[in-house]
């Protein structure tokens, strides 16, 4: 009798391993194997596929194979028995094409309200995304144990804190990689719980905003107690992205640390230019607190994002202001790179009733002023970018008189 | 295949000091941070400090500063821990450990016995 | 600086038993604690580390739990190679502490 060829190959790929699955063409034919050929594109002889021969069940992993994973492969597969069947030839494909990004490995730190994610690619170097190592993101779904209220977080590198969480509860969490360039997504890791810790007895510190005065940069948070000393870290918010690596390397500021003040005050040639992450820790001396959320810290923004500088003309019944680039020590300006919103504040020396305008222009009219009344100015600039959403502090005040009624000029 | 390689056992007089060092393979120190840690016969633990070879940046236990120095030499990829002033409570055996992903101390060198004699 | 008390210097156990390690910590350290494990005349070794994640090659009889000040290492159907000195250690804060260890007997 002669034997049917195997029908209906599927190719499995996730990560580096390479499944075959296919359905026998006959039941009823007992003892049969299996074995296929490959054939790389360019290349007329076909290969036996080591790992997949003379196999006895309806699948077979070729994963051993080193493939050039860009490259198109062809399979066919034949059924052998006493004689053999003819060869079932499968579709040509790319295995780079092909594959699915597994599940992710995830490794998780509990704190009384946060957990650190650490994540890392489910095949530790892997062929298959050698050139996507760094451009894998994840998103996860998390959700309190007791509740199942999901919450989805998109667009993380391999490690994540979540914050504002409550003290000894459990969560549970499952993450995903993405490929964005290769627009892959991949399959979701199991289900990892942690509970977090009874409370701690000092809170981090909150609120932790960065600002620019002369050379410097100053560093405030708040926090609850006095009679604290407090520290400050930095790390390369690069590092967060580097996926085999789960040492992080946070760095003293040297200024910051054991500071007794709510702030802090460094130079600004303290960090070259790029995004960092700063984070703050308080202590009693005998207890500390866990470490504040990261903030992020952009150099570029922060310093081009100093407060505008501005002149003021003065008219009965207005002002026209006129707003310029910032100056830095050595009286040059800086150059914004950035589109910037301009907020000016006004109000009258002898009351405390503050008048808002936000403007996008650089000359703004402030309008309905009574004559001969001293008004005081404030501006500040904040950037467009929602995502950096970064503030420059506000100018110092300049006041000036209106003009005496009548005069337009 | 990681391996600490410590330097051999020293046998030195009260008030002097004493280099040891330990030398890394199979991995970039780097990468990582060094660690230095003090077992006295039958007692515990004690760390000593660490150091991030990438840039020299050190930490110490505030009751071995002064006492303990250490640095690194990425070059021939080893790190040192000189012990000066030592006294009897210096006797010990002192361990180089590296300190890798989540900061845990997954590799230990052999251990380099310090004798302390007056 | 965190104090790590192991409150039992030895235990006593029989092969093929569970016994239970425990490690207090003098203030709230999250999960960051690590087991280490150290045979006579040997240099210690991680067993377990992030309070519950047993290092690579660590047979899985070894468990470890716990989280803020209370934490647990529990080997359960004790072996021979399990004779050893355990000693538990916090990286939530610098200086790194150990606690004082407990010694394991096998009757």
């Known amino acids: 009798k002669n034997l049917k060829s195997p029908q209906k190959v599927e190719v499995d790929i996730i990560d580096d391993n390479f499944i075959l699955r296919w359905n026998r063409s006959d039941e009823s034919v007992g003892n049969v194997t299996f074995s296929f050929d490959y054939q790389k594109t360019g290349m007329d002889n076909w290969i036996k596929l080591s790992g997949c021969q003379n196999i006895t069940s309806t699948k077979c992993n070729f994963s051993s194979l080193k493939l050039n994973v860009y490259e198109e492969i062809k399979l066919r597969i034949r059924a052998e028995k006493e004689n053999t069947s003819s060869w079932y030839e499968v579709d040509s494909f790319t295995p780079f094409r092909k594959a699915q990004i597994g599940p992710p490995e995830v490794h998780l730190e509990a704190e009384d309200k946060a957990i650190v994610i650490h994540i890392s690619p489910g095949t530790k170097d892997s062929v298959m995304w050698a050139l996507d190592g760094l451009s894998f993101t994840y998103s996860l779904v998390i959700w309190k144990n007791s509740s199942g209220v999901e919450e989805r977080i998109e667009n993380i590198y391999s490690r994540h804190k979540i914050y504002k969480l409550s003290p000894e509860t459990t969560y549970c969490l499952k993450v995903k990689a993405a490929l964005l360039t290769s627009w892959k997504i991949g399959v979701y890791s199991p289900v990892h719980c942690i509970k977090t810790t009874v409370e701690n007895e000092l809170p981090p510190p909150e609120n932790i905003e960065v600002s620019v005065q002369n050379q410097n940069y100053v560093l405030k948070w708040d926090y609850t107690y006095a009679n604290m000393t407090f520290q400050v870290q930095w790390l390369h918010a690069f590092l967060k992205r580097n996926p085999g690596n789960h040492l992080y390397k946070w760095k003293q500021i040297p200024d910051c640390e054991n500071v007794k003040t709510t702030q802090c005050v460094f130079p600004q040639n303290v960090f070259q230019k790029g995004i960092y992450l700063l984070r703050v820790q308080a202590s009693d001396g005998n207890n500390t607190s866990f470490w504040s959320e990261e903030i992020k810290f952009d150099t570029e923004i922060q310093a081009f994002l100093l407060p505008p500088v501005f002149n003021i003309r003065s008219l009965s019944d207005s002002f026209h202001i006129y707003i310029g680039a910032p100056k830095q020590s050595g009286n040059t300006p800086v150059i914004q790179d950035y589109p910037l919103i301009y907020e000016i504040i006004f109000w009258e020396n002898t009351s405390n009733a503050e008048r808002k305008i936000i403007e996008k222009k650089t000359d703004v009219t402030v309008p309905n002023l009574k004559p001969l009344t001293v008004y005081c100015v404030k501006a500040r600039a904040h950037t467009m970018d929602e995502k950096l959403n970064k503030s420059s502090v506000f100018s110092d005040a300049v006041c000036e008189k209106t003009k005496p009624g009548n005069t337009s000029k | 295949e990681v391996q600490l390689q410590q330097s051999g056992a020293e046998l030195v007089k009260s008030g002097a000091s004493v280099r040891l060092s330990c030398t890394a393979s199979?991995?970039?120190?780097?990468?990582?941070?060094m660690h230095w840690v003090k077992q006295r016969t039958e007692k515990g633990l004690e760390w000593i400090g660490r150091?991030?070879?990438?840039?020299?940046?050190?930490k110490y236990v505030p009751k071995f500063q002064g006492k303990a120095t250490i640095t690194a030499d990425t070059s021939s990829n080893t790190v040192y821990l000189q012990l000066n002033s030592l006294t009897s409570e210096d006797t010990a055996v002192y361990y180089c450990?590296?300190?890798?992903?989540?900061?845990?101390?997954?590799?230990w060198g052999q251990g380099t016995s310090v004798t302390v004699s007056s | 600086d965190i104090v790590m008390t192991q409150s039992q210097k030895f235990m006593s156990t029989s092969v093929g038993d569970r016994v239970s390690v425990t490690c207090k910590a003098s203030?709230?350290?999250?999960?960051?604690v690590a087991w280490y494990q150290q045979k006579p005349g040997q240099s210690p070794k991680v067993v377990i580390y992030?309070?519950?994640y047993r290092y690579n090659g660590v047979p899985d009889r070894f468990t470890g739990s716990g989280s803020g000040t209370d934490f647990t290492l529990t080997i359960s159907n004790v072996q021979p190679e399990d004779l050893a000195e355990y000693f538990c250690?916090?990286?939530?804060?610098?200086?790194?502490?150990f606690g004082s260890g407990t010694k394991l007997e096998i009757k």
């Open positions: 992030s309070a519950s």
């Open positions: 199979g991995f970039n120190i780097k990468d990582y941070y």
């Open positions: 450990v590296r300190g890798g992903n989540y900061y845990v101390m997954d590799y």
């Open positions: 150091i991030d070879p990438e840039d020299g940046e050190t």
């Open positions: 203030q709230n350290v999250g999960t960051y």
């Open positions: 250690q916090q990286y939530n804060n610098y200086p790194l502490t």
